[in-house]
Interface confidence: medium
């Protein structure tokens, strides 16, 4: 809290300019009118105010707007945004994407702070859904943003927004998140032709069910091993050796290097050794010839 002291003669600020960097904190408090600051916020970012001086400027705005800043001020906060607490931000009503971009720009190159997380949350809730332009903006600043959302939050993403998602945006998503995103992606890309469709859907396939993988195996897609290794184990297990061979195409040889890792390991255990041998890769661990395979899940369903 800065003491209330009279402004020294001749020091009253008539505009927000570089001369203010030479003011001590108490002088800023006494000599800068809050209403003037609010109307000239766009200038603050161009002036090298220190961290400490920004505290004073924030204090002045807090006094002027105890119920929360108007968007006209928020949009021009610049570095002053760094001084805001999540509690401050919860009082705001941010509706403009330009405002969001301006504030994310201030934090660019830094990890997502609690302030930024609160800002995004307020913005998205205000819009009612994560539309394409918002998602585009957020993933541009924070490629991991999508994967930071819960499956429940992801359910509000409209399929049309999926076009804004890049493969790297999904790098840290877990299977539960991909389970939600995959059907949206399937819907978004449904009118594309085979090869183009596969390029777009590839990064979402960690949420694909068995029947979709079987369908893809009929389309000469040549899935790479990195994508295959991210597939749901329960979706891969029912695939036949022939289907996996078609799905991977020339990449099938990579199975040997991954035979001890999921889902390849578990898939091998479910295949007849005879069938695995047809690949000529030396994969071991399949069901020996002459053994009867009982599908227990089917048995349970019938009983």
């Amino acid at each position: 809290e800065v003491e209330k002291t009279a402004c020294p003669s001749g020091k009253k600020a008539r505009e927000i300019d570089e001369s203010l960097i030479f003011y001590k904190k108490w002088e800023l408090e006494a000599c800068v009118d809050a209403a003037l600051l609010a109307t000239q916020m766009d200038r603050v970012n161009a002036i090298p105010f220190t961290y400490e001086q920004l505290d004073v400027l924030k204090h002045k705005l807090d006094e002027l707007y105890p119920q929360g800043y108007p968007e006209s001020v928020i949009q021009h906060l610049g570095y002053l945004f760094l001084k805001m607490s999540p509690e401050d931000i919860r009082k705001w009503n941010v509706t403009s994407l330009e405002t969001l971009k301006a504030l994310l720009e201030v934090n660019k190159g830094h990890e997502m702070s609690p302030q930024v997380a609160t800002l995004i949350d307020r913005f998205v809730k205000g819009r009612g859904q994560l539309d394409k332009d918002t998602l585009d903006t957020l993933t541009a600043f924070y490629p991991g943003y999508l994967c930071s959302l819960s499956p429940e939050e992801l359910s509000s993403v409209p399929p049309s927004s999926i076009w804004a998602v890049r493969p790297q945006d999904l790098d840290t998503c877990d299977p539960r998140q991909l389970d939600v995103l995959y059907p949206k992606a399937r819907l978004a890309f449904q009118n594309m032709n085979g090869s183009e469709y596969f390029v777009k859907i590839q990064s979402f396939l960690g949420g694909a069910p068995t029947e979709d993988l079987k369908a893809l195996s009929q389309q000469n897609v040549s899935m790479d091993l990195a994508t295959f290794m991210k597939l749901r184990t329960d979706a891969v297990l029912p695939l036949t050796v022939a289907e996996v061979q078609k799905l991977l195409g020339p990449h099938v040889e990579g199975l040997k290097a991954e035979e001890r890792h999921r889902p390849v390991r578990d898939w091998i255990l479910r295949q007849r050794q005879d069938d695995l041998d047809t690949l000529g890769l030396g994969l071991q661990g399949g069901i020996p010839n002459g053994y009867l395979v009982l599908d227990l899940s089917m048995q349970e369903a019938l009983s």
Epitope: I21, P48, F49, T50, Y51, E52, L54, Y79, L82
Partner: nanobody, 117 residues
């Protein structure tokens, strides 16, 4: 975190000159605005000159026309050329970042400038 070491101070006659240097460690130095500050005995520390990352400068009225701030980003160094020194310039001089991102509460030792009449 940027570490700052000031040097170049000394005893000088009124009207004389000194050149202060501030060596900074830290890869982000070139992106920070920097400032030279001074603190005379019994007085508050005050900013005397500032320089942006791009090199634009600003001076307190009391030193305008006499002091020049400059920077060499390749050497991670900020300078303060002080000409026509006056006894009232006597103080400990410090440099520090003026980045809005960095709380500038970690000050170096400073360098003493004494101007005798």
């Amino acid at each position: 975190e940027v570490q700052l070491v000031e040097s170049g101070g000394g005893l000088v006659q009124a009207g004389g000159s000194l050149r202060l240097s501030c060596a900074a460690s830290g890869s982000t130095f070139s992106s920070y605005p920097m400032g030279w500050y001074r603190q005379a005995p019994g007085k508050q520390r005050e900013l005397v000159a500032a320089i942006s990352s791009g090199g634009s400068t600003n001076y307190a009225d009391s030193v305008k026309g006499r002091f020049t701030i400059s920077r060499d980003n390749a050497k991670n160094t900020v300078y303060l050329q002080m000409n026509s020194l006056k006894p009232e310039d006597t103080a400990v001089y410090y440099c520090n970042t003026r980045s809005p991102r960095v709380p500038n509460d970690s000050w170096g030792q400073g360098t003493q400038v004494t101007v005798s009449s």
